[in-house]
């Protein structure tokens, strides 16, 4: 059997660190057998069998010029093997972050904090941490760890399915390369990392007869589980075209009527979502949707000159479809007492 331990990585490759002494091992001989070493493609002897180093080649303070293939041979000239030296660095603790788009699953992503230059893999696992007593703050690992299944195709991500919203988890991401391993432990709670996906299906429509109104509607993100226990709240922003500042409102449901739009101008609208009890953070904004208020209609009563007649806000009844997912207010308000009253002044 070979005297050379096979490091994780491709066969026939051995590894070292720049600036450090590197030992190469001749794989096809018995441990301690004296061998000769050559660089592949160079006939001069690098180290002879009388070196006292047996089956090993020692390269002091290796640098990039030492990378390449080496040949070792026995005393009588038989090939002992070929070894390729690759230089790099031991793993450093990876950078790990976790996020959840819903309250049942979360994913963790990682990246190396230092490039090792060597073949690298990651071991990912998690364990659930439980509170031992009602009053105790002391936490201890429960059963586990369990593997955190990694995405295929080498994406640096693993997903924990069926997580418990109120539990805390310890994530272990270990970077492994032929020179060692380094672990990052991260404690996460679903409540703190929850960040819903942005709402979907945002539509912006004019309200016929109301030149300063726009009706926006949207749906829950598809990734949010369909259970009534965990609701989302929303934040809506809108602005006229070419206007730098957004106006922000917090709708109560899945629809909002904007009553202070600028007549005749297209408006950008976007929405964001968050757990209704303020767990985690707001989602990113949805893609913008655009709408332009309808042109105003002339009211039936024309006020006398100098008088401004305020036409009461009476909206035509609109059949609002029931939201497909739970919301704080399943039938959203069409009017909002906070909105300014539209006034139509007709000058003779």
């Amino acid at each position: 059997s070979s005297p050379c331990p096979q490091a994780w990585g491709p066969p026939g490759v051995q590894y070292g660190q720049p600036g450090r002494s590197v030992k190469l091992c001749c794989p096809g001989v018995t441990a301690g057998d004296p061998v000769s070493w050559f660089r592949d493609g160079e006939p001069k002897l690098l180290q002879g069998p009388d070196s006292g180093l047996g089956h090993e080649l020692v390269l002091a303070q290796a640098d990039s010029t030492d990378e390449g293939t080496y040949i070792c041979q026995t005393l009588d000239g038989a090939l002992g093997g070929t070894v390729t030296l690759q230089l790099g660095y031991p793993p450093a603790r990876p950078v790990v972050s976790c996020q959840a788009a819903d309250y049942e699953n979360f994913s963790c992503t990682w990246s190396p904090s230092q490039i090792s230059g060597l073949p690298t893999r990651y071991l990912t696992s998690y364990r659930k941490k439980t509170v031992l007593g009602a009053d105790s703050q002391r936490r201890s690992p429960s059963t586990g760890p369990w593997p955190c299944p990694q995405d295929p195709l080498g994406a640096a991500r693993c997903v924990v399915h069926g997580a418990e919203f109120w539990s805390q988890y310890r994530i272990n991401v270990t970077e492994v390369n032929p020179l060692g391993a380094s672990t990052r432990l991260l404690d996460v709670s679903l409540q703190s990392i929850l960040r819903p996906d942005p709402p979907q299906g945002l539509r912006v429509e004019s309200v016929p007869g109301y030149p300063r109104r726009l009706r926006a509607s949207w749906t829950y993100p598809a990734s949010w589980p369909c259970q009534p226990h965990f609701l989302l709240k929303f934040r809506l922003q809108y602005r006229p075209a070419q206007h730098p500042a957004w106006s922000t409102v917090e709708p109560a449901g899945l629809e909002e009527v904007i009553t202070d739009a600028v007549a005749g101008l297209p408006h950008a609208v976007r929405v964001s979502a968050r757990d209704f009890l303020d767990a985690g953070t707001w989602s990113t904004w949805s893609p913008e949707a655009w709408g332009t208020p309808s042109t105003g209609t002339i009211p039936k009563e024309i006020p006398a000159w100098g008088q401004l007649h305020t036409q009461p806000e009476v909206e035509p009844q609109v059949d609002s479809p029931a939201p497909p997912r739970p919301s704080l207010q399943p039938h959203p308000r069409l009017l909002d007492h906070r909105d300014s009253v539209e006034q139509v002044a007709v000058l003779a």
Epitope: S36, F38, E42, P43, K44, L45, G48, I71, Q73, D76, G77, A78, L79
Partner: antibody, heavy 117, light 107 residues
């Protein structure tokens, strides 16, 4: 014991090719390099090249690289050296030699190649 | 290519005498220098490798020395069978090259 038995003498015309064989026995063929050398009449030794034991990787003397091809048949433990575009100055005794990467420890008996019109 | 120059071209000595053969390289080759003996009608035989390392089966009267560019093969006490042609060979760089030989003849 190690033995390298080469093919017999050849007479070739200028421009022709010659293929010399070297049958090895008495050792594990794929553990050692095979070198080819030649010695012109009354002259010194000239290294033509070598072929690797397991991967058939070759190192050729640049002087011959456009004209020489070294191959092995592992199933019969035989090495071959073919030299093309022969000229009169290629008249020599051609040797195969088992060696390590750069040394020649066991030699064949030699094959005389005569190039003459 | 590295050129090896052997001297003398011919050395005439009597059995029992000490023979000293020289090989000079056109550039420094460390200890990557080897010695061969060739008798008429025979293939060469390896005598010394890496300037001074002995070869199994070779009589102890053969020894080598030197490093860099200057190398010496010494036969401490000549035997009748030692009269032959001696070649040096370098393995410092491709192509592997030989000296032109020193003929050791009986005086």
């Amino acid at each position: 014991q190690v033995q390298l038995v080469q093919s017999g003498a050849e007479v070739k015309k200028p421009g022709a090719s010659v293929k010399v064989s070297c049958k090895a026995s008495g050792y594990t063929f794929t553990n050692y390099w095979m070198h080819w050398l030649r010695q012109r009449p009354g002259q010194g030794l000239e290294w033509i090249g070598n072929i690797g034991p397991s991967d058939s990787k070759t190192h050729y003397n640049q002087k011959f690289k456009d004209r020489v091809t070294m191959t092995v048949d592992k199933s019969t433990s035989t090495a071959y050296m073919e030299l093309s575009s022969l000229r009169s100055e290629d008249t020599a005794v051609y040797y195969c030699a088992r060696g390590d990467y750069v040394l020649f420890t066991y030699w064949g008996q030699g094959t005389l190649v005569t190039v003459s019109s | 290519d590295i050129v090896l120059t052997q001297s003398p071209a011919t050395l005439s000595l009597s059995p029992g005498e000490r023979a000293t053969l020289s090989c000079r390289a056109s550039q420094s080759i460390s200890n990557n220098l080897h010695w061969y003996q060739q008798k008429p009608g025979q293939a060469p035989r390896l005598l010394i490798k890496y300037a001074s390392q002995s070869i199994s089966g070779i009589p102890a009267r053969f020894s080598g020395s030197g490093s860099g560019t200057d190398f010496t093969l010494t036969i401490s006490s000549l035997e009748p069978e030692d009269f032959a042609v001696y070649f040096c060979q370098q393995s410092y760089s491709w192509p592997l090259t030989f000296g032109q030989g020193t003929k050791l003849e009986i005086k």
